[in-house]
């Protein structure tokens, strides 16, 4: 069991683990969610996306959180639950970005450029909100990245 | 060989009670979710419940909530599924499914136990 | 609550491509599965993730899912495929399925 975004393999995630994590803080994420009107992962960013593309756009997306949105919050929460949570869902985006290796050859410059404009929707969506409420909408719109990621899980 | 096998369903008058069993085999059972789909007679598949590996997530279906209850005891690798205030609608074969993602991948199914709920 | 819409029946010649569609609001940002349904039996996977077969299913079951509408395709339908085929999808923390579809392989 593991995930093929196109050309890139990742393996040793287990899926479960990052719903558990997820859904152990969900509730506390959406309910503190007050934009409900706005979408981060709107329909743009993971609609159609190609194989080819997704192993550029998972990649940007993953650091994004991983170096804006869990490294942020977690200045910002104390709840040990929360924490611990957040440090699943981290350790395994850490796992899958580490795993990831995107190729930089020039006959693939339209397709990271595709990738770079979906995630630039997402980037720019983001940062249209103030900085707590941003952080809060990302965190609750995990489980629609779990869900797309879905899509290129093998059993 | 991965193995799934529903018990304890019944015959219930309305407004009884019962407790479904899945017992589960051939897989490390607390590393999925599982889930309770149920099929009405000459009916369509309708999802009823979902409990995460560690048990501590549960969902329902708007039709069981408040009249359901899912659990799991990972000790026995068993899956359970009360149910009270049982309706004449909520006769159907109940299925346990495996969820190989743990939200909604039901790559394998049990056979399924009868439940009737007639006066 | 999420809905996913199926043609109640489908009918397809021995040999030929049948094509059962799954219709959903923006259904081509959720992974899609589909099951294959024999009376008295269990449903069993034939597709996950839009397109990808599980190991022993035939060749000739193929998937996509794009924009509201998703599709299980069989290439060179045979007689042992005449069953019910259901889509399903996870949205907001449930699993929903559609209602259905009977192929009957003439």
């Known amino acids: 069991q593991e995930f093929h975004f196109g050309p890139c393999q990742v393996k040793g995630v287990v899926p479960q683990k990052l719903w558990e994590a997820f859904w152990a803080v969900k509730d506390t994420m959406q309910a503190q969610d007050n934009i409900t009107s706005a979408r981060l992962l709107q329909q743009e960013v993971l609609q159609n996306v190609s194989d080819a593309e997704s192993c550029y756009l998972v990649h940007t997306l993953l650091e994004f959180y991983l170096k804006t949105v869990f490294k942020n919050y977690h200045n910002r929460t104390v709840e040990v639950r929360t924490l611990k949570s957040f440090s699943t869902l981290a350790n395994n985006f850490v796992l899958i970005v580490s795993q990831l290796q995107p190729s930089q050859e020039n006959e693939m410059f339209s397709i990271r450029d595709s990738a770079h404009r979906r995630f630039l929707l997402f980037r720019r969506a983001f940062k249209q909100l103030d900085v707590e409420a941003a952080l809060t909408k990302a965190l609750g719109e995990v489980d629609i990245l779990l869900t797309w990621m879905q899509k290129f899980y093998k059993l | 060989q991965l193995q799934l096998v529903e018990s304890g369903g019944a015959l219930v008058q309305p407004g009884g009670s019962l407790r479904l069993s899945c017992a589960a085999s051939?897989?490390?059972?607390?590393?999925?979710?599982m889930s309770w789909v149920r099929q009405a007679p000459g009916k369509g598949l309708e999802w009823v419940s979902h409990?995460?590996?560690?048990?501590?997530?549960?969902f329902y279906a708007e039709s069981m909530k408040g009249r359901a209850t899912i659990s799991r005891d990972n000790a026995k690798n068993t899956l359970y599924l009360q149910m009270n205030s049982l309706k004449s609608e909520d006769t159907a074969v109940y299925y346990c499914?495996?969820?190989?993602?743990?939200?909604?991948?039901?790559?394998?199914w049990g056979q399924g136990t009868q439940v009737t709920v007639s006066s | 609550s999420y809905e996913l819409t199926q043609s109640p029946s489908v009918s397809v010649a021995l040999k030929q491509t049948a094509k059962i569609t799954c219709g959903g609001d923006?259904?081509?940002?959720?992974?899609a599965q589909w099951y294959q349904q024999k009376p008295g039996q269990a449903p069993v996977l034939v597709i996950y993730?839009?397109?990808r077969r599980p190991s022993g299913i035939p060749e000739r079951f193929s998937g996509s899912n794009s924009g509201n509408t998703a599709t299980l395709t069989i290439s060179g339908a045979q007689a042992e495929d005449e069953a019910d085929y259901y889509c399903?999808?996870?949205?907001?923390?449930?699993?929903?399925f559609g209602g259905g579809t009977h192929l009957t392989v003439l």
């Open positions: 051939g897989f490390t059972f607390d590393d999925y979710a």
């Open positions: 399903q999808v996870w949205d907001s923390s449930a699993a929903v």
């Open positions: 499914a495996k969820d190989d993602y743990g939200s909604g991948l039901y790559a394998y």
């Open positions: 409990i995460s590996g560690n048990g501590f997530s549960t």
């Open positions: 993730a839009d397109s």
């Open positions: 923006n259904i081509g940002s959720k992974s």
